[in-house]
């Protein structure tokens, strides 16, 4: 069998909401993956499991099942959304993310994704992880892979 390639493209969008009383941030992060099937036969994408970490703490998980079938020598782009919650011991981030006076509230998140593919009864898992900048202060739609290159703006006094 030839390889199945998984390429994490980046964050497509991040939609933010807050709970002021709980000092909690809710971020719905949509990511984009390219999965390439270099084989001369179809491959089933059984599931995608993803998790997001902030400061070494898992803040969100997602799992997609029975996703798609990728034909021979074909490539499919798949979007998946991970709902994340920044709260409790990280509630100090609420102050930063809700600062009106800061234009871009970028935080560094680690995106981890594992794609499980199947062909002829055989399963294969391919994992990727990437650090990404995400704006926790406003709803943002990113250009393809743009989020990789943003600078982190720390609050200055």
């Amino acid at each position: 069998p030839r390889s199945i390639e998984v390429k994490y493209i980046g964050v497509k969008s991040a939609y933010v909401s807050y709970d002021a009383e709980k000092r909690t941030i809710y971020l719905n992060i949509t990511n984009t993956l390219n999965i390439t099937n270099n084989n001369y036969y179809s491959v089933e994408v059984e599931n995608i499991t993803a998790q997001v970490q902030f400061s070494k703490t898992v803040i969100g998980k997602a799992r997609l099942n029975n996703i798609t079938n990728i034909g021979p020598l074909d490539m499919k782009q798949i979007d998946y959304t991970v709902p994340t919650v920044i709260a409790e011991e990280m509630s100090y981030m609420y102050d930063f993310c809700t600062l009106l006076s800061i234009k871009v509230h970028n935080i560094v998140l680690m995106m981890q994704v594992t794609v499980t593919t199947a062909y002829f009864g055989h399963s294969e898992q391919i994992s990727q992880e990437r650090y990404q900048y995400v704006d926790c202060g406003r709803n943002t739609t990113y250009q393809l892979a743009q989020s990789e290159y943003l600078n982190v703006l720390q609050p200055q006094q």
Epitope: Y18, R23, I102, K103, Q156
Partner: antibody
Framework: QVQLQQSGAELVKPGASVKISCKGS????????MNWVKQRPGKGLEWIGQ????????NYNGKFKGKATLTADKSSTTAYIHLSSLTSEDSAVYFC????????????WGQGTSVTVSS | DVVMTQTPLSLPVSLGDQASISCRSS???????????LHWYVQKPGQSPKLLIY???NRFSGVPDRFSGSGSGTDFTLKISRVEAEDLGVYFC?????????FGGGTKLESK
């Protein structure tokens, strides 16, 4: 320390225009919104609008749209306000003020520039 | 626009007295993020305004603890526990919760 140095007083004729400058130093100029505030003699304060020097983004008080134009030059760390079609109502002291990140208030102000409109 | 109403317009005090200035807004100043953006400034003759209190009750750096702010929603108060000569000037409340940002008309704190 943060300093905002404004240009000197202006005496202009009605119908003319004027451009006031505000040079910021001692902080990351591009990353802070710069606000402009008007104060007429013996009167209160009026917020004109703000500019983000990093990308030139602006927010205006509707009352001053068409009257004031805000610009900024990152290379010289200077913000500008251009006031057009001046009348006696525009005679005032104009302040620039930085919007602080932590306190989320206008925590540093320029010394003010007096504009007098008179024929 | 949000109207900020300050009272009194003028406040004559004896040095050492307590002074209290009220500020009312025409609508709630609680932002959707839960914060209330009500600030207090003081302006002395011939000078630019200076930040005194931010977000209702937080003293700005270098501001003496005789200054305190309180309130919520639409009603706010600035108190000076023992007025000193250097405190005389015009005090303004200001809101930045809603655009356009607006200021109160000012309260002149003066010596009796």
């Amino acid at each position: 320390q943060v300093q905002l140095q404004q240009s000197g007083a202006e005496l202009v004729k009605p119908g003319a225009s004027v451009k006031i400058s505000c040079k910021g130093s001692g902080y990351a100029f591009s990353s802070y919104w710069m606000n402009w505030v008007k104060q007429r003699p013996g009167k209160g304060l009026e917020w004109i609008g703000q500019i983000y020097p990093g990308d030139g983004d602006t927010n205006y008080n509707g009352k001053f749209k068409g009257k004031a134009t805000l610009t900024a030059d990152k290379s010289s760390t200077t913000a500008y306000i251009h006031l057009s079609s001046l009348t006696s109502e525009d005679s005032a002291v104009y302040f620039c003020a930085r919007w602080g990140h932590y306190d989320e208030a206008m925590d540093d102000w320029g010394q003010g520039t007096s504009v007098t409109v008179s024929s | 626009d949000v109207v900020m109403t300050q009272t009194p317009l003028s406040l004559p005090v004896s040095l050492g007295d307590q002074a209290s200035i009220s500020c009312r807004s025409s609508q709630s100043l609680v932002h959707s993020n839960g914060k209330t953006y009500l600030h207090w400034y003081v302006q002395k003759p011939g000078q630019s305004p200076k930040l005194l209190i931010y977000k209702i009750s937080n003293r700005f750096s270098g501001v003496p603890d005789r200054f305190s702010g309180s309130g919520s929603g639409t009603d706010f108060t600035l108190k000076i526990s023992r007025v000193e000569a250097e405190d005389l000037g015009v005090y303004f409340c200001s809101q930045i919760t809603h655009v356009p940002w607006t200021f109160g008309g000012g309260t002149k704190l003066e010596s009796k």
